[in-house]
Interface confidence: medium
């Protein structure tokens, strides 16, 4: 069986939320059992069509209505022929969208006027991703390349911080971190606290 992907480039870049149909053409077999494979695992769902063009020419379609980051990867189709599995050339599917946060600023409790740090990291594609920092409704830092650490010399009241990630597809806003004031026991001096408070909160879920 001559097996090839039809009309699809080796690298396919699609914007998040857009539809994609991957095509696979199988010639030289009367009844191919076409399987789609993503990153080595057979795609086990019904988002597939198999169309006989002629007796020995079939086209398989893998249809994705609205791609998201988890759909990115290496796709190929395969058929069994005489006990051997033949595989097609792969298609690399890249899903582009607004930045996705891998680290967002975390809530902290710090003594008055004590220095602390907040972390923010976001990824594409597309890259590069730049970070802008906000204190309440005031822009206070950036744009700087991701990842970014905001060094704050101290606060005297509970304050809200957030970061914004930008790339060619647009921007995404992080969660808002609240930095609370730690109650300091009488007799201790707040400005003697020089240790840094790190924020490295991971946000694995991706919500469309």
């Amino acid at each position: 069986a001559g097996l090839k992907l039809m009309g699809a480039p080796v690298k396919l870049t699609v914007s998040q939320g857009q539809p994609v149909k991957l095509n696979c053409s199988v010639e030289g077999m009367e009844e191919p059992d076409i399987q789609w494979v993503k990153d080595g695992a057979v795609v086990q769902n019904l988002d597939q069509l198999y169309i006989p063009v002629s007796e020995q020419h079939w086209i398989g379609f893998l249809s994705l209505k609205s791609v998201e980051r988890s759909d990115a990867g290496r796709y190929w189709c395969q058929v069994e022929d005489g006990g051997e599995t033949e595989i097609s050339q792969p298609v690399w599917l890249t899903v582009e969208g607004v930045p996705f946060f891998t680290v967002e600023p975390k809530d902290l409790a710090v003594p008055p006027n004590a220095p602390f740090q907040l972390s923010c990291e976001a990824v594409g594609p597309p890259e590069p991703v730049t970070i802008v920092w906000w204190r309440g409704t005031t822009k206070i830092g950036g744009p700087a390349p991701s990842p970014s650490v905001l060094n704050v010399t101290g606060v005297t009241q509970s304050t809200m911080f957030s970061c914004e990630a930008h790339n060619l597809k647009g921007l995404a806003s992080s969660r808002t971190a609240t930095v609370h004031l730690q109650l300091v026991p009488r007799g201790s001096s707040a400005h003697h606290h020089h240790h840094h408070h790190h924020s490295a909160w991971s946000h694995p879920q991706f919500e469309k």
């Epitope: 009309g7 769902n45 063009v53 209505k65």
Partner: antibody, heavy 125, light 108 residues
Framework: EVQLVQSGADVKKPGASLTISCQAS????????ISWVRQKPGKGLEWMGQ????????LYGPSFQGHVTISADRSTATAYLQWRSLEASDTAMYYC??????????????????WGPGTLVTVSS | SYELTQPPSVSVSPGQTARITCSGD??????AYWYQQKSGQAPVLVIY???KRSSGIPERFSGSSSGTMATLTISGAQVEDEADYYC???????????FGGGTKLTVL
């Protein structure tokens, strides 16, 4: 012309076994999937499961898994829906449906379906 | 198990626009299909892949999908459009199909 010819209406008692059939013509049976769809009297449509004539690979809806068996005979281009032990709640019209697609210009699939006329199954003591 | 939710009934006057909705958590990722079933007849595919009209279906029938909601629109409904309409889609897992509960369209 694509045709799906279903077996005639049947009346059975609870606990009886039954097989109904759907014979396909006008196309290559092994090229397509055939689904079975249930419609109880005065109620909506329910997808039961499907079989691909080519490899007799089957898929079932969660409500029907284990209660019915879908099979096919390639030599006669016929799909079957089988019960080992009928219940009164199985009383319904059963449709077989051929799923299909054609290509326009060789790359864009256009979806279509052919439905059989239905087989009425009545289960009553 | 996965469900698609439709309103039980929709009524319009002849010439008005009828809209029938179908909601399901997987619809942002799975295509919706629409069937028309007239009394005593087998269903007919009207719309496939959210918005594509099946061959032989009048242009007044259209489909759309946004988020978790798919919509069948009949612009200028006619008396002969009176029927039950069902949406149909893949489950969130993609392993089985599901019909909505059906909507009875009355064209008064």
């Amino acid at each position: 012309e694509v045709q799906l010819v279903q077996s005639g209406a049947d009346v059975k008692k609870p606990g009886a076994s039954l097989t109904i059939s759907c014979q396909a013509s006008g196309y290559t049976f092994t090229d397509y999937w055939i689904s079975w769809v249930r419609q109880k009297p005065g109620k909506g449509l329910e997808w039961m499961g499907q079989i691909r004539g080519q490899h007799s690979s089957t898929l079932y809806g969660p409500s029907f898994q284990g209660h019915v068996t879908i099979s096919a005979d390639r030599s006669t281009a016929t799909a079957y829906l089988q019960w080992r032990s009928l219940e009164a709640s199985d009383t319904a019209m059963y449709y077989c449906v051929r799923h299909g697609a054609s290509t326009s210009g060789g790359t864009i699939p256009e979806y279509y379906q052919h439905w059989g006329p239905g087989t009425l199954v009545t289960v009553s003591s | 198990s996965y469900e698609l939710t439709q309103p039980p009934s929709v009524s319009v006057s002849p010439g008005q626009t009828a809209r029938i909705t179908c909601s399901g958590d997987a619809l942002p990722k799975k295509y919706a299909y629409w069937y028309q079933q007239k009394s005593g007849q087998a269903p007919v595919l009207v719309i496939y892949e959210d918005a594509k009209r099946s061959s032989g279906i009048p242009e007044r029938f259209s489909g759309s999908s946004s988020g978790t909601m798919a919509t069948l629109t009949i612009s200028g409904a006619q008396v002969e459009d009176e029927a039950d309409y069902y949406c149909y889609s893949l489950s969130d897992s993609g392993n089985y199909f599901v019909f909505g509960g059906g909507t009875k369209l009355t064209v008064l």
